[in-house]
């Protein structure tokens, strides 16, 4: 079966991109067609992660599927189209002037993408302007082989960047998470994401977010005051997608930021985060690269306590156990630490207020030749009720001016053996990191001290 629909406002079209499904337009399917699709959907969610080289965890530690392996598998699955949103591309060592064997996985991925194009599978890339990889030739190489590339001028449009990181493959499969299209994300940076297979409902909903970037990537694009109806979502916080993931009853939805890129029905990312925090009754565990209750990249900085207040309120008013694991690397802005200390200062076990903050330090070891690496880049949160996997760091810019996406998943325990729910898996990954020797309490982190592994 094939879904063919007429072109819609500015959206990617064949050969432009996917030839066999609705290009991000609203599902206006005939009942029978919808039924066929439902039968064909057998959604499966797999957590994926990158563990940097030379970062051993204790023997027997839980781990998710390696990200590089998952990406290569997704590309093997592709038959029609691959849509990628990524802040920047830097899949080869020479891109950043580095000669290191750990770039080989990224280079293999770039090769694989070129092979896809050779097999007449369409590739559409939305990337950011401004970008972090101004010397990278990856996108020129792919464009020369037929990939469509659009640089979305978020700097001009919203004074932010396109910081999203996700793939939609054949309108059925998804990757989303913290990893950019960067070889370091596969071997030198700690990342966390999710792959969802065989789930056209969710994939085509996420495709609508890709389409918002795509239409803004044309010359002289302007932000629409109201997004056309075909960008609207019917899957959100109030009406999540409901289905069986590997037999487990699951609800899920994608959120997006900034609000200016949230068409009707799309839950804003900040709202999703706050909703997950607000519904927690036992614990909130969050792992984010950066945590600033301020603006980040604008001058002068403004105070922005929205997430900070939500964590404090959960701990203080509801007795929720809060754990925050923040990254600490050579390129970490040290002005973050006073905010972390302030948050932790709220903790008062005697009054049943539990707030713990640690920093995660990836030892540089003999990888000092690789810039902007050896860091925990993950952006996720888990409660006893839900898993949130995101692409945004926790400061105002990422929610007000910069693009990002979040995935909120809740699975019903008891339908499967214990430990099978996504939120339980994510909790275990968090606790593995939290209890590892790389997670250091703030007391062990002198003010202004460089984030250098002292182990």
């Amino acid at each position: 079966w094939q879904v063919r629909r007429p072109p819609t406002w500015g959206q990617v079209q064949p050969k432009d991109v996917p030839r066999s499904w609705g290009h991000g337009s609203s599902p206006a399917l005939e009942p029978l067609e919808a039924e066929v699709r439902k039968q064909r959907d057998s959604c499966q969610l797999v957590l994926v992660e990158s563990i940097p080289q030379d970062l051993p965890f204790a023997a027997g530690s839980l781990s998710a599927q390696p990200l590089g392996q998952a990406w290569l598998q997704l590309l093997d699955t592709a038959q029609e189209s691959v849509h990628v949103a990524s802040y920047y591309w830097s899949l080869t060592g020479p891109d950043i002037g580095v000669n290191d064997s750990s770039s080989q996985l990224g280079e293999a991925l770039l090769q694989k993408l070129q092979q896809l194009l050779g097999r007449n599978i369409s590739l559409a890339v939305a990337t950011s302007s401004p970008t972090l990889a101004r010397k990278s030739t990856d996108l020129q190489v792919l464009a020369a082989r037929g990939a469509q590339v659009r640089r979305v001028p978020m700097g001009r449009l919203t004074r932010g960047v396109l910081h999203s990181k996700f793939w939609v493959v054949d309108g059925r499969h998804i990757y989303m998470g913290s990893a950019n299209m960067d070889w370091r994300s596969l071997t030198q940076v700690k990342e966390l994401g999710a792959v969802i297979y065989n789930c056209s409902h969710l994939a085509q909903d996420l495709e609508k977010t890709f389409q918002t970037y795509w239409v803004l990537g044309v010359p002289k694009a302007v932000l629409p005051k109201t997004w056309p109806q075909n960008f609207s979502s019917h899957i959100n916080r109030f009406q999540p997608f409901q289905g069986l993931f590997d037999g487990v009853p699951t609800t899920a939805y994608f959120s997006a930021s900034p609000p200016a890129l949230c068409p009707q029905g799309r839950t804003p990312d900040l709202e999703a985060l706050l909703a997950v925090m607000g519904s927690a009754q036992e614990f909130i565990y969050a792992s984010v690269m950066e945590y600033f209750p301020t603006t980040r990249f604008s001058h002068p900085r403004r105070y922005w306590p929205v997430l900070d207040n939500a964590l404090r309120a959960a701990a203080f008013s509801k007795g929720v156990r809060v754990r925050l694991l923040v990254s600490c690397g050579l390129n970490t802005d040290p002005t973050m630490f006073p905010y972390l200390r302030s948050l932790q200062a709220l903790s008062n076990p005697a009054a049943n207020v539990s707030v713990d903050v640690k920093v995660f330090i990836v030892p540089v070891g003999n990888h000092s030749n690789i810039p902007f690496s050896r860091v925990n880049h993950s952006k996720f949160m888990v409660t006893e009720k839900a898993a949130y996997i995101g692409t945004s760091n926790w400061s105002e810019d990422y929610f007000s001016s910069t693009t990002g996406v979040g995935l909120v998943v809740t699975q019903s325990p008891g339908a499967q053996p214990a430990g099978a729910t996504v939120q339980e898996q994510l909790r275990q990954l968090f606790e593995r990191d939290w209890s590892s020797r790389y997670a250091v309490g703030l007391d062990g982190q002198a003010p202004g001290q460089d984030c250098v592994w002292q182990g």
């Epitope: 401004p130 972090l132 700097g155 690269m289 902007f372 460089d450």
Partner: antibody
Framework: DVQLQESGPGLVKPSQSLSLTCSVT???????YYWTWIRQFPGNKLEWM?????????NYNPSLKNRISITRDTSKNQFFLKLNSVTTEDTATYNC?????????????????WGAGTTVTVSS | DIQMTQTTSSLSASLGDRVTISCRAS??????LNWYQQKPDGTVKLLIY???RLHSGVPSRFSGSGSGTDYSLTISNLEQEDVATYFC?????????FGGGTKLEIK
């Protein structure tokens, strides 16, 4: 407050080496920035010469590549410029500056702190 | 290397005037452009980064705009303390390159 101050001889003979020091106070040169030398020729033209990164790596202007070296002494929080085989064309005011900030995810880089500059004349 | 050209090497204007200084790159620099002010005593200060973002402490009468190869710095209400030379600088690629400067004087 971050401050940068250049020092070194004001007069250098042709064919000799020019050596300058930039002393940094209020910030560690092992953190978050490219520590840069920029010179301004008579008539105002500015030329980026090169940097030493927070991690000790270098990048130089190809027009100077065979003559320039930028090093540092982290214990003194200083970085240095050495320019070999100078000619009268190297007469300029030499400024040190920092470029960055090189925080994760930040695409906006600029020279936000400059030294006052030191004038070097190349003459026999 | 990317060449940066400021065609006007000097200009004079009256207090309160709106002044625009332009800068052209030899190729598209995708908004990776900064503006600096050099006072007569030689001190250099960052004014604007990434084409249009005002640096901390810079008065709001300064603004920047442009795209592709053409950029400009505007001072909306000229004050005596704005007497200086203004430089554009690209950070799209290495080596970093600067415009030749525009010297601004008061009539």
């Amino acid at each position: 407050d971050v401050q940068l101050q250049e020092s070194g001889p004001g007069l250098v003979k042709p064919s000799q080496s020019l050596s300058l020091t930039c002393s940094v106070t209020g910030y560690s040169i092992t953190s978050h920035y490219y520590w840069t030398w920029i010179r301004q020729f008579p008539g105002n033209k500015l030329e980026w010469m090169g940097y030493i990164s927070y991690d000790g790596s270098n990048n130089y202007n190809p027009s100077l590549k065979n003559r320039i070296s930028i090093t540092r002494d982290t214990s003194k929080n200083q970085f240095f410029l050495k320019l070999n085989s100078v000619t009268t064309e190297d007469t300029a005011t030499y400024n040190c500056a920092r470029e960055g900030p090189l925080y994760y995810g930040n695409p906006y880089w600029y020279f936000d702190v400059w030294g006052a500059g030191t004038t070097v004349t190349v003459s026999s | 290397d990317i060449q940066m050209t400021q065609t006007t090497s000097s200009l004079s204007a009256s207090l309160g005037d709106r002044v625009t200084i332009s800068c052209r790159a030899s190729q598209d620099i995708d908004n990776y452009l900064n503006w600096y002010q050099q006072k007569p005593d030689g001190t250099v200060k960052l004014l604007i980064y990434y084409t249009s973002r005002l640096h901390s402490g810079v008065p709001s009468r300064f603004s920047g705009s442009g795209s592709g190869t053409d950029y400009s710095l505007t001072i909306s209400n000229l004050e005596q303390e704005d007497v200086a030379t203004y430089f554009c600088q690209q950070f799209n690629t290495l080596p970093r390159t600067f415009g030749g400067g525009t010297k601004l004087e008061i009539k």
